[in-house]
Each structure stands twice: as structure tokens, then as C-alpha cells.
């Protein structure tokens, strides 16, 4: 038996991912264990195997299919179990009626690239991956800077109430080491949260011209 | 402005059949579910049938085996094939459309249609 609070959270990613984190207090050692998927309203059911994240939380990826296919809506409810191995016998850990659409979290934008960088400014493009067409152009990002002798917690947000997959920092010193992050959210679900932060981006801006004023 | 328009509903014996439709017109939107719901009075409006998405549709237990559920999604349109009717299928029949507009999510009802099954 299993002693102390479980929590058991889970995100969609509004196409063909579940994305799940299973944490206990009392830890379960050399213990198996899965999250197990079943629809109310579909055919199929999914299974994917829980592995350890830290010393008392465990994380696994439920696949429902091809990495851009329309796998649920708004109607759907999975029921999600964590399900433990206790000899021959699987025992239910945790359950949850979950409802895709009112925890939403986006994977993480991708092909962050310079368009442009100048002495003061830098031009930067990303892209957006596994997003419903449901939500159409209506996400919002936000963004932020890492500047030379501070951390990312320092760095200040800059907010984008649009789908815009770009931005133009400005302000930047010449001559200057720099990583840029973007992060994306839709507006619809009760639960959503912000993506992860995208890989970082590492810039330098021009030097300034000699002989002129910057 | 978002509209459902049903039709389709009547007087029908028992035994006999209907067919109601029900169409999605208005500004921008994107449809993900489509069904039918029935009211008779003092009591809730319940499920009859609806479709999501990837051909998900679902049953009330009470119509499983004689109505069916047809969306047609490039017209926002669904249909409601009734046969086999009962009495107790008399009520009125509304239609639901959960609609995506401007990044969120809601659902919509049409009027209602009268449907009457006669012993």
C-alpha cells in the first residue's frame, strides 16, 4: 500500500498529445506503472508508460495518433487512470475525468531564427507546432530576453495579444551576447496554461560602426 | 450573428418516420460538434444524438438502432433520420452547434421543432 498525497495533472496540446504527471508522496520503488486513456466517445484507447522525473514524480506522453491529426474536441472526455503493478495485479492510483479542451497547454514554439539583426535591434521569426486549426490566428505569446549578467527570471515579458510569429527587440547594446524565448497559449480552457518556453535563441548584435556615435 | 434553422418536424404515426435538418449560417466560425437535443415538459432537455469531429457520434440508449446522425460539415448541416417512432419520442427537438469563433469556444441552439408521434 501507498502512503501520503498523490497529484495527478494533465495537459493536451489541442491535437494528438496528452501529456501527463503523476507525483506521490510516499515513493513507490521499482514499482511499474502506466496512465491509461479511454474515451467516452472514440474507438480508440491509449496507454503510455510512466517514468521517473524526479525522486517522487513520474511523466509520460499519451500518443493518440499522427502528430497533427484532430484526435478530440470540445465534447470528448477521457477518463485517466494511473495504474501501478502490485504483482500480478494493476492497481488504480489516481483517476481523472479529463476534458481536453479546458487544459490546453501547446507544445513549445519551434524554428526560432534571426531575420534581421542590427547594431540596436534584432528581427526574430518563430513558428508554432501541433496547434488546432480551432483556434485559427487566435493565440497569444510571450516573449523575453536574456541579457548579459542577468537570468531568465529577471528578464522582463513581452506580451504579443496576437498571432504574430515574430518580433523586433530594440533598445540592445551593440556588440552584444543575447538568447531570446517565446512561449504561445490559446485563449480558450479553464485549466490552460502557457506552453514551455521555446529552446533559447542565442544572438549578437552588430558592432557599432567606428568613429560613430551609438 | 450566429443562427441555427431547424426543420423537418411534424405530425408522424407510430411506426412512421421523420427526417429534421438543421443548418448553421453567420459570421466566421468553425464547427466541431454538431447534435440534437429533445425537451418534453417538466423535464430537462436531454441528448438525443450528436457528431464531433472524426465521425464520433453518440446515442441516447432510448433511439440506438432507429435514428441516425449525419453532419455535414462543409455545409454546417445536420440531419436527424428518425424511424421506428414511439409516443415517447414526441417532444421538442432542438439543435446544438458548438462553434469555434475568434479562438474560443460556445455552444449555440436553434428555435426547437415540434415533433408529435401519434398512437
Known amino acids: 500500500a501507498v502512503n501520503g498525497t498523490s497529484q495527478f495533472t494533465c495537459f493536451y496540446n489541442s491535437r494528438a498529445n496528452i501529456s501527463c504527471v503523476w507525483s506521490q508522496d510516499g515513493a513507490l520503488q521499482d514499482t511499474s506503472c502506466q496512465v491509461h486513456a479511454w474515451p467516452d466517445r472514440r474507438r480508440w484507447n491509449q496507454t503510455c508508460e510512466l517514468l521517473p522525473v524526479s525522486q517522487a514524480s513520474w511523466a509520460c506522453n499519451l500518443i493518440l495518433g499522427a502528430p497533427d491529426s484532430q484526435k478530440l474536441t470540445t465534447v470528448d472526455i477521457v477518463t485517466l487512470r494511473v495504474l501501478c503493478r502490485e504483482g500480478v495485479r494493476w492497481r488504480v492510483m489516481a483517476i481523472q475525468d479529463f476534458k481536453p479542451f479546458e487544459n490546453l497547454r501547446l507544445m513549445a514554439p519551434i524554428s526560432l531564427q534571426v531575420v534581421h539583426v542590427e547594431t540596436h535591434r534584432c528581427n526574430i521569426s518563430w513558428e508554432i507546432s501541433q496547434a488546432s486549426h480551432y483556434f485559427e490566428r487566435h493565440l497569444e505569446f510571450e516573449a523575453r530576453t536574456l541579457s548579459p549578467g542577468h537570468t531568465w527570471e529577471e528578464a522582463p515579458l513581452l506580451t504579443l495579444k496576437q498571432k504574430q510569429e515574430w518580433i523586433c527587440l530594440e533598445t540592445l547594446t551593440p556588440d552584444t551576447q543575447y538568447e531570446f524565448q517565446v512561449r504561445v497559449k490559446p485563449l480558450q480552457g479553464e485549466f490552460t496554461t502557457w506552453s514551455p518556453w521555446s529552446q533559447p535563441l542565442a544572438f549578437r548584435t552588430k558592432p557599432a560602426a567606428l568613429g560613430k556615435d551609438t | 450573428q450566429v443562427q441555427l434553422v431547424e426543420s423537418g418536424g411534424g405530425l408522424v404515426q407510430t411506426g412512421g418516420s421523420l427526417r429534421l435538418s438543421c443548418a448553421v449560417s453567420g459570421s466566421h466560425f468553425i464547427s466541431d460538434v454538431m447534435g440534437w437535443y429533445r425537451q418534453v415538459p417538466e423535464k430537462q432537455r436531454e441528448l438525443v444524438a450528436d457528431?464531433?469531429?472524426?465521425?464520433?457520434?453518440k446515442y441516447a440508449d432510448s433511439v440506438k438502432g432507429r435514428f441516425s446522425i449525419l453532419r455535414d460539415s462543409v455545409k454546417n448541416t445536420v440531419y436527424l433520420q428518425m424511424s421506428s417512432l414511439k409516443p415517447e419520442d414526441t417532444g421538442i427537438y432542438y439543435c446544438?452547434?458548438?462553434?469555434?469563433?475568434?479562438?474560443?469556444?460556445?455552444?449555440?441552439w436553434g428555435q426547437g421543432t415540434q415533433v408529435t408521434v401519434s398512437s
Open positions: 457528431m464531433a469531429d472524426g465521425n464520433s457520434a
Open positions: 446544438k452547434a458548438g462553434l469555434w469563433i475568434a479562438g474560443r469556444h460556445s455552444d449555440y
